[in-house]
């Protein structure tokens, strides 16, 4: 993780990277390692990919641990095969405005992710493409069996966003936050990122927070019941601690996680709030991280890696944050 | 953001007509039904009515000669009324979203008085 | 005339198990009910928990499940939280009318 001790490389000669990353000296000059990129954790060790003018920002001057590679002021954006200016707002689609900050996009729904519970008026409601209309509007489907007594389960519904609008005035500043990302991993450790000019200057700003959906040594398939196609949020028999790059958090805790679907839908936290969490390193060094805790998750079929990817990404964002 | 917002007088005398007006947003009330609810002082909820999402209506049978439920879908708005007021109709009235009753105004208290 | 009757108070302890009912004077509650459960916590306006018998909303926790046990409608609080201390109402659909209970005080003790 540091670099007083002596270098010490993998056998093989130099690791294969993905296409697009580069290969570059880990920040001890000693072996060469595939580089970090936008939004992944960063040490010493595992630098920034330079090339893509990252550099690893650990928060504050106290942490020199563990960072979150980030792109250099004023950096542009890459999004949908056109580059964007940092500060440029754009219209990804007709549903969501985007903002670029420093190599980063964070986006708002244009479109209303409203919830409809089943009502004698609306038994079956679902979402649905008009045609002519951007946003999904509710349809009430009547009972196609009419045998069929009271109201179905309602359609999986979009996770909206609730609790305080995004968007408010403030003393000559419209203060606007995007929704936290999707956590970059499915399981285990990850990061999830937003920007927000919610600050004394109205300067638009980013935020990071580590995040874990699930943890990935966990099997949760077997606990899902009989008859039953999904298990939302899986209960945690015990208090754990978590691990950071080596380092593990001083309290335990009671976190919930989202669980798995056998149906081919996913489940992704749809209400969250953000703690700060402290690790302490072996090296005795403490450090605090603003880390993402799920109250409730939701199963849906918006799975990350469908047709459309910013749509795709958008459903796994986090709604309704505390924080 | 959904929200539902009711207005109207807080003092209304005796054989008067009270007119309440639930103001949407976040929302369409093509889409949504909107019930309209009051609880007297130091009781439960009482379920006046409801104006559906096409514009039909149901009344609570003990006030339909009295209550009319209308909208208008431009502007938002639905207006409830109730003729021939009573100092037992002294409650606070709210107006909330068909489907579970998920989003309900803050209230509006209305007193009947001479 | 239709009377939908709830347990007026429970008391729960903290992680404990509470099941609120609510009963309908002329049978046994079904899923053409449509039973809602709506929550009051003190100072703070009325929401929806579950609606069409046992439909979460969004802000529902898990741990709040609505069904149907025994011709009631149920409200079934596992893990109770300090929070969860609040007026409970249920309201059920008769065709053209629905109707509220008269409310369950939840108290989470101390």
């Known amino acids: 993780q540091n670099c007083s001790g002596p270098c010490r490389c993998p056998a093989e000669q130099a690791p294969r990277c993905p296409a697009g990353v580069s290969l570059v000296l880990d920040g001890c000059g000693c072996c060469r390692v595939c580089a970090k990129q936008l939004g992944e954790l960063c040490t010493e060790r595992d630098p920034c990919d330079p090339h893509k003018g990252l550099f690893c920002d650990f928060g504050s001057p106290a942490n020199r641990k563990i960072g979150v590679c980030t792109a250099k002021d004023g950096a542009p954006c890459i999004f949908g095969g056109t580059v964007y200016r940092s500060g440029e707002s754009f219209q990804s689609s007709c549903k969501y405005q985007c903002t670029c900050l420093d190599g980063a996009v964070g986006c708002m729904p244009l479109c209303s992710m409203d919830v409809r519970l089943p009502s004698p008026d609306c038994p079956f409601p679902r979402r649905v493409k008009l045609p002519g209309k951007c946003c999904e509007e509710w349809v009430c489907d009547e009972p196609k069996d009419q045998t069929v007594v009271g109201p179905a389960l309602a359609a999986y519904r979009l996770e909206d966003t609730f609790g305080p609008d995004p968007t408010m005035i403030r003393a000559n500043c419209l203060v606007q936050t995007t929704e936290w990302s999707a956590c970059s991993k499915t399981c285990g450790m990850g990061i999830s990122t937003r920007v927000t000019n919610d600050n004394a200057s109205c300067r638009l700003e980013k935020q990071s927070r580590l995040c874990m959906v699930r943890p990935c040594e966990a099997d949760l398939e077997e606990n899902i019941k009989k008859g039953k196609k999904c298990i939302r949020t899986p209960k945690i028999s015990k208090p754990i601690k978590f691990e950071l790059s080596g380092c593990t958090s001083v309290k335990t805790y009671r976190a919930k996680f989202c669980g798995v679907c056998t149906d081919g839908r996913c489940c992704t936290p749809h209400r969250t709030t953000t703690l700060p969490v402290e690790f302490k390193c072996p090296d005795g060094e403490v450090m605090k991280k603003n880390m993402m805790f799920i109250k409730t998750c939701a199963c849906h079929y918006n799975c990350p890696g469908d047709n459309d990817i910013f749509e795709s990404l958008y459903y796994r964002k986090m709604y309704g944050d505390m924080a | 953001e959904v929200t539902l917002k009711e207005s109207g007088p807080v003092l209304v005398k005796p054989t008067e007509t009270l007119t309440l007006t639930c103001t949407v947003s976040g929302f369409s009330l093509s889409t949504f039904g909107v019930h309209w609810i009051r609880q007297p002082p130091g009781k439960g909820l009482e379920w006046l009515g409801v104006?559906?999402?096409?514009?039909?209506?149901d009344y609570n049978a003990a006030f339909m000669s009295r209550l009319t439920i209308s909208k208008d879908t431009s502007k938002s708005q639905v207006v409830f009324t109730m003729t021939n007021m009573d100092p037992v109709d002294t409650a606070t009235y709210y107006c909330?979203?068909?489907?579970?009753?998920?989003?309900w105004g803050q209230g509006t208290t209305v007193t009947v008085s001479s | 005339e239709t009377v939908v009757t709830q347990e007026p108070s429970l008391t729960v302890s903290p992680g404990g198990t509470v099941t609120l009912t609510c009963r309908s004077s002329i049978g046994a509650v079904t899923t053409s009910n449509y039973a809602n459960w709506v929550q009051q916590k003190p100072g703070q306006a009325f929401r929806g928990l579950i609606g069409g018998t046992s439909n979460r909303a969004p802000w529902t926790p898990a741990r709040f499940s609505g069904s149907l046990l025994g011709g009631k409608a149920a409200l079934t609080l596992s893990g109770v939280q300090p929070e969860d201390e609040a007026e409970y109402y249920c309201?059920?659909?008769?065709?053209?009318?629905?109707?509220f209970g008269g409310g369950t005080k939840l108290t989470v003790l101390g």
């Open positions: 104006i559906w999402r096409r514009g039909g209506t």
């Open positions: 309201a059920l659909w008769y065709s053209t009318h629905y109707v």
């Open positions: 909330a979203r068909d489907g579970g009753f998920d989003y």
